[in-house]
Amino acid sequence: VSLRIQEGCSHLPSCCPSKEQEPPEEWLKWSSASVSPPEPLSHTHHAESCRASKDGPLNSRAISPWSYELDRDLNRVPQDLYHARCLCPHCVSLQTGSHMDPLGNSVPLYHNQTVFYRRPCHGEEGTHRRYCLERRLYRVSLACVCVRPRVMA
Amino acid sequence: VSLRIQEGCSHLPSCCPSKEQEPPEEWLKWSSASVSPPEPLSHTHHAESCRASKDGPLNSRAISPWSYELDRDLNRVPQDLYHARCLCPHCVSLQTGSHMDPLGNSVPLYHNQTVFYRRPCHGEEGTHRRYCLERRLYRVSLACVCVRPRVMA
């Protein structure tokens, strides 16, 4: 199975044959991009609470801690994306690791990621055996960051 | 120009024809993913210094400020990637925005991003008119995060 850049198809970026009525295993292999978030998923309780741990993954040690939420779509490449969800409105104190400091805000860092969606190819013969890969920008929150509140001029 | 999932090529995920000796304009249109980093690039001086601003983009307001370094490869999708480079070893004080607090470390958050590389297709007829798209995981630093130092058990 391969992706072929090919002329003669109006769809950007792709039209692709597929086996009718069969889950396309090769597509799954190809499209299953990194299925882990930037930091290993932590299933311990502290990953879901507003405190900065002294161990564990970076997202739980941060003073703007966050958890990862899975966004899965099998018709997309990558199939699995992870969104960071801030666990505190303010930053956690470096001293205590638990009390919030109103001087700092914990805010998500957003990014428009390039993804590809599998779509039916319209206006082609044999549409049952074709799909198109459509490139899109998809907004994901990468992490939560401790920032000084914006001062309006 | 389109991407076609096609059998009969040993390269995962793709083999693709290209116009010989011509810059592939359609490839450029297709592959030019979001060429901006998560936050707008700031050309002001404070974006490159170890201080937390009270205005400007998120990466300069963070108490773990960072700058973006462009990583451009025209044979890759996306062509442009941005790496976060931490501007301070420690977190900046929320009070002053300039003095560093040794209680916190400013560390990069890494992520293995899915990218596609344009490669010659080996073992195929008409190789001059073909290239392959090869899926790879590519490590990028997304941002810098203020964390409590890890305490070893």
Epitope: S18, K19, E20, Q21, E22, P23, P24, E69, L70, D71, R72, D73, L74, N75, R76, L81, H83, R118, R119, P120, T127, H128, R129, R130, Y131 | -
Partner: antibody, heavy 123, light 108 residues
Framework: QVQLKESGPGLVAPSQSLSITCTVS????????INWVRQPPGKGLEWLGM???????HYNSVLKSRLSISKDNSMSQIFLKMNSLQTDDTARYYC?????????????????WGQGTSVTVSS | QIVLTQSPATMSASPGEKVTMTCSAS?????MYWYQQKTGSSPRLLIY???NLASGVPVRFSGSGSGTSYSLTISRVEAEDAATYYC???????????FGGGTKLEIK
């Protein structure tokens, strides 16, 4: 052929836990997702949660803290556990197969449903 | 979280008539599905990813729409179509399946 069958306790006392098992046949749990849906008497359908073929789970955000979905692929069984039941949890609980492929795309419809199991919360 | 609003809540039609019911989403929806539930039975998939008809569904049923506005049409209603019809959407993030409140179709 594809079949799903729910089995539950029928009656649960308030504040107690509910455990329902969905036993499937005609397909493999590693290839499909399973959704849990409930329907209070005379009311509409409410999605509770889902488990993917690889075991990843998603829950209704309102009920997340009370729900747990797990499965045993070898036994072809999916389990729903719900804590701290109240009278408004009285409903018919359904399991439904999710994710079918038509040769082009994956669809997130619930294409096969169990007959449901009735749960009454009462003292 | 996307909210699906179905209208009308109840409707009646005579055999042979054409009926249309709508499903309005609070924000744009990518995947929309329709189910039929007869009294005392489990829901049955009718339409997947509008406008595709599920296996075994009579061609008198059709689905249309995009974005925030969808509809289900029965070209010539039959007595056996008396049921409640639900629209349902799926979103990958936040990962949810959402049902509309339902439209009850009565046959005169």
């Amino acid at each position: 052929q594809v079949q799903l069958k729910e089995s539950g306790p029928g009656l649960v006392a308030p504040s107690q836990s509910l455990s329902i098992t969905c036993t499937v046949s005609g397909f493999s749990l590693t290839d499909y997702g399973i959704n849990w849906v409930r329907q209070p008497p005379g009311k509409g359908l409410e999605w509770l949660g889902m488990i993917w073929g690889d075991g990843v789970t998603h829950y209704n955000s309102v009920l997340k803290s009370r729900l747990s979905i797990s499965k045993d692929n070898s036994m072809s069984q999916i389990f729903l556990k719900m804590n701290s039941l109240q009278t408004d949890d009285t409903a018919r609980y359904y399991c439904a197969r999710t994710l079918f492929y038509d040769g082009t795309l994956y669809y997130y419809a619930m294409d096969y449903w169990g007959q449901g199991t009735s749960v009454t919360v009462s003292s | 979280q996307i909210v699906l609003t179905q209208s009308p809540a109840t409707m009646s039609a005579s055999p042979g008539e054409k009926v249309t019911m709508t499903c309005s989403a609070s924000s744009s929806v990518t995947y929309m599905y329709w189910y039929q539930q007869k009294t005392g039975s489990s829901p049955r998939l009718l339409i997947y990813d509008t406008p595709n008809l599920a296996s075994g569904v009579p061609v008198r049923f059709s689905g249309s729409g995009s974005g925030t506005s969808y509809s289900l049409t029965i070209s010539r209603v039959e007595a056996e179509d008396a049921a409640t019809y639900y629209c349902q959407q799926w979103s990958s993030y936040p990962h949810t399946w959402t049902f509309g409140g339902g439209t009850k179709l009565e046959i005169k």
